[in-house]
């Protein structure tokens, strides 16, 4: 085995020293005789040491001893000691005490034999064992004066060989992570929590991360244990985008033929039932009423026109009831109602005319007289030398309860090619031309159109007291919605509790699964903000879909096109949610179609207005938008534009 030069020297030095020991002792006796007992010259000293270096070292110092203690002849004991010590260059010991194993006296010199871990001429320099191959340590080498030792990083312990390290399994201690999951790692360990939770080292437990504090959501953020959900202003036409954090516009995904006809007059614009057109005719010359127009509707009931004076005088009202024309008239305070002719709410154009003759009124449909009524008097009434007639279209100038027979005045119908009193009517034409809301859709089908900008609501009761149950109330909510959506997000049906400003129930279209944070087209059934059931739907296929919802004590079902939806809650959660719903139903609730009022976006999974065609049946009764307590004026109650044909 070969040793490095320095170590080899250290190994050999003591042996060498022992070999010279005999000669050293002889030399000492010779020095005593020549230079201690006697005064010696340089040459005599040379004879003692038999070499120049030792002589050159000794002699100047010898003279120093003489100077200090006097000549040998004074017999000063200090002189003898002074001289005897001069040739031994290890006395006094020049080597470092800590690092020297032995001092070797050499010819005019000395050699410090170092202990292991020390070096330098005087063995006063610490050898850094760590500088070469890390001192043989696997991880950490600690150098120290004259020595070194190995240690390990945190999470490791030193093996019995004092050099290698082995991992400590901290997870063996059941208290390492407290409630959290412990995962051992090389030299460490990690306390793991489920997504949405973070480990608290103080509490040794998983704590919910409030992601909302991190500003992840563009609009409204709701934190939940282990998660969060972002909400967008649905009523403002926004929905969650693909990243589930930012918002984007709700855009139509099915184009509807919403083009309007500038030469048409829409009669259903005023939900209040007030007329869409008010005309007053005045003549010096006595004149008779002549009115003719083309008309189209699917609506079974409503007012086409009124002609006459104030409500207590003489007037006629042409209306629709059960799809047939009805004429209500009052002449000199005496009222009558006549109904006749074919069903005309078939959605096709037909020409209707009203003509006042000398002693009767004639109503015609497509030039065929369907009513001829004898009357005593004129509709134009004289006043201060002029004959007056008020004519209103799509409503009456007084309350419907003051009619001969009350009627719902609202009429979702369309008029064109009108002619009043054989006159050229530029006024209405000019007004309609610049006001698109007064115009009709060019083409319509049956249904109700929700334009994505408003809702309708009703005051309906969902509690019932069956005779066989006595006074105990039961409840049910059964909704059938026939929908042809134009957009992928919107409220179809909802209940609103005005007192609590809560949404006890909602059925809506949504394009993501909120808990799975997954984009998917769904129908959601929810009580307040909790989804009870979800069902996939092909919302943008331009086809009609049937959404059925049934809720009663103990059960809640959602079906789309006959396929039952997936429950999102446990049986216990369902019971709790249904109990919440029932509590709401015992207080006043309003039934909303096509949207919600201005509620917080977190009140329900969806707050956006529905866009598309829809008819709603609630508890086996078809909802008529003309009968609503309120309807947005852009919702058409009995007509819907068709889906635009695909471009060739």
């Amino acid at each position: 085995a070969l040793l490095p030069a320095r170590e080899a020297t250290q190994f050999l030095r003591p042996r060498q020293r022992r070999a010279f020991q005999v000669f050293e002792e002889a030399k000492q006796g010779h020095l005593e005789r020549e230079c201690v007992e006697e005064l010696c010259s340089r040459e005599e000293a040379r004879e003692v040491f038999e070499n120049d270096p030792e002589t050159d070292y000794f002699y100047p110092r010898y003279l120093d001893c003489i100077n200090k203690y006097g000549s040998p002849y004074t017999k000063n004991s200090g002189f003898a000691t002074c001289v005897q010590n001069l040739p031994d260059q290890c006395t006094p010991n020049p080597c470092d005490r800590k690092g020297t194993q032995a001092c070797q006296d050499l010819m005019g010199n000395f050699f410090c034999l170092c202990k292991a871990g020390w070096g330098g001429r005087l063995c006063d320099k610490d050898v850094n064992e760590c500088s070469q191959e890390n001192g043989g340590c696997l991880q950490i080498c600690h150098n120290k004066p004259g020595s070194f030792h190995c240690s390990c990083h945190s999470g490791f312990e030193l093996s019995s060989d004092g050099r290698t390290c082995q991992d400590i399994d901290e997870c063996a201690d059941s208290e390492a992570c407290g409630e959290a999951r412990c995962k051992n790692l090389p030299g460490s360990y990690s306390c793991l929590c489920d997504e949405g939770f973070a480990y608290s080292s103080q509490e040794k437990a998983c704590r919910d991360v409030d992601e909302c504090l991190q500003g992840r959501c563009e609009q409204v953020c709701v934190n939940s244990p282990g998660s969060y959900t972002c909400h967008c202003d649905g009523r403002g036409g926004l929905k969650l985008s693909q990243d589930m954090d930012t918002c984007e516009d709700i855009l139509p995904c099915v184009p509807f033929s919403v083009a309007k006809s500038v030469k048409s007059l829409y009669l259903g614009r005023m939900f209040s039932g007030t007329p869409v057109i008010r005309l007053r005719f005045k003549r010096l010359q006595p004149t008779r009423l002549v009115a003719e127009f083309d008309f189209r509707t699917f609506d079974p009931e409503g007012i086409l026109l009124f002609a006459g004076g104030h409500q207590d005088s003489t007037w006629i009202v042409l209306a629709l009831r059960a799809g047939r024309l009805e004429l209500q008239l009052r002449y000199n305070g005496v009222g009558r109602v006549t109904s006749s002719g074919p069903v005309i709410n078939h959605g096709m154009w037909q020409t209707i005319s009203v003509e006042e003759l000398a002693r009767n009124l004639v109503i015609k449909v497509n030039r065929d007289a369907v009513m001829k009524i004898a009357v005593a008097g004129d509709l134009f009434q004289p006043e201060r030398g002029l004959y007056h007639l008020n004519l209103t279209v799509g409503g009456i100038p007084f309350h419907e309860k003051d009619l001969v027979q009350p009627i719902n005045p609202r009429l979702d119908g369309c008029m064109r090619s009108w002619n009043w009193l054989n006159g050229e009517d530029t006024t209405i034409q000019e007004t309609v031309k610049v006001n698109t809301r007064m115009q009709c859709f060019s083409v319509t089908e049956r249904g109700s159109f929700y334009p994505g900008s408003g809702f309708a609501f009703y005051s309906l009761d969902y509690m019932r007291t069956p005779l066989d149950v006595g006074t105990e109330s039961t409840w049910e909510v059964e909704v059938v919605a026939h929908i042809r959506p134009a957009a992928d997000t919107g409220v179809l049906f909802a209940l609103w509790a005005p007192d609590l400003r809560a949404v006890p129930l909602s059925v809506a279209l949504v394009d993501y699964h909120s808990t799975k944070k997954l984009k998917k087209q769904l129908v959601v059934l929810a009580v307040e903000h909790t989804a009870l059931a979800l069902m996939e739907i092909k919302v943008c296929d331009g086809q009609e879909h049937v959404v059925t919802v049934s809720l009663r004590d103990g059960e809640a079902t959602l079906e789309v096109d006959g396929t039952r939806g997936q429950s999102e809650v446990s049986a216990a959660q369902l019971q709790e949610r249904l109990a919440v719903l029932e509590r709401h139903l015992r207080s006043p609730v309003l039934t909303f179609a096509g949207g919600l009022p201005d509620v917080p976006v977190t009140s329900a999974p969806v707050t956006a207005f529905y866009r598309g065609c829809m008819t709603l049946e609630v508890n086996r009764r078809l909802l008529d938008l003309d009968e609503a307590a309120y309807k947005h004026s852009d919702i058409t109650a009995h007509s819907c534009p068709p889906v635009e044909p695909a471009a060739a």
């Epitope: 007053r280 005045k282 002029l386």
Partner: antibody, heavy 116, light 107 residues
Framework: QIHLVQSGPELKKPGASVKISCKAS????????MNWVKQAPGQGLKWMGW????????TYTEEFKGRFVFSLDTSVTTAYLQISTLKAEDTATYFC?????????WGQGTLITVSS | ETTVTQSPSSLSVSVGDRVTITCITS??????MNWYQQKPGKAPKLLIS???TLRPGVPSRFSSSGSGTDFTFTISSTQPEDFADYYC?????????FGQGTKLEIK
């Protein structure tokens, strides 16, 4: 298109008579009465009265009773204004206007100048 | 007979100015007031009919208000083509009566 076209200007001597015409087109003549309005030079408008185109019955305001006559020829859908025993103060532009309680459609006016 | 008093009889304004003309009736005529514009050598043109109704094709700078006996006609910002004579006409009762007229001149 509704039009009322009046006859041309007339220069007459005091004491003479004049008959001006107003030809109606573009609507049913007998459905609307015909009005007559006078405007003296630099003066305002004055309603003279009207004629029922169904019955031919005229109605005159107090100021225009006597020398003024409204008449019709329904076959040619024309209304006439005749002024007899003309006076200097009859110098004016006379307009016909269709009755609809107010006046929307007017003739272009006929200037009658009475001067000796 | 309902008399109509129109004021002022003449008015001198600059282009862009706001103009107001007033008519007062001797009886309550509800809102049966009409307003006409007449240019030299032409027939009057109906601008606003009963019920303060702006006639088709008439610019929106013309407006009127009033009911009962006090009526106001306004041009919000006078244009060069607006310099003409203006008349009010009540059509509540026979005889129909005009106001004396207002001459709108350029300043």
């Amino acid at each position: 298109q509704i039009h009322l076209v009046q006859s041309g200007p007339e220069l007459k001597k005091p004491g003479a008579s004049v008959k001006i015409s107003c030809k109606a087109s573009g609507y049913t003549f007998t459905n609307y009465g015909m009005n007559w309005v006078k405007q003296a030079p630099g003066q305002g408008l004055k309603w003279m009265g009207w004629i029922n185109t169904n019955t031919g019955e005229p109605t005159y305001t107090e100021e225009f009773k006597g020398r003024f006559v409204f008449s019709l020829d329904t076959s040619v859908t024309t209304a006439y204004l005749q002024i007899s025993t003309l006076k200097a103060e009859d110098t004016a532009t006379y307009f016909c206007a269709r009755d609809e309680g107010w006046f929307v459609y007017w003739g272009q006016g006929t200037l009658i100048t009475v001067s000796s | 007979e309902t008399t109509v008093t129109q004021s002022p009889s003449s008015l001198s304004v600059s282009v862009g100015d706001r103009v107001t003309i007033t008519c007062i009736t001797s009886t309550d005529i509800d809102d049966d007031m009409n307003w006409y514009q007449q240019k030299p050598g032409k027939a009057p043109k109906l601008l606003i009919s009963e019920g303060n109704t702006l006639r088709p094709g008439v610019p929106s700078r013309f407006s009127s208000s009033g009911s009962g006996t006090d009526f106001t006609f306004t041009i919000s910002s006078t244009q060069p083509e607006d310099f003409a004579d203006y008349y009010c006409l009540q059509t509540d009762s026979v005889p129909l009566t005009f106001g004396q007229g207002t001459k709108l001149e350029i300043k």
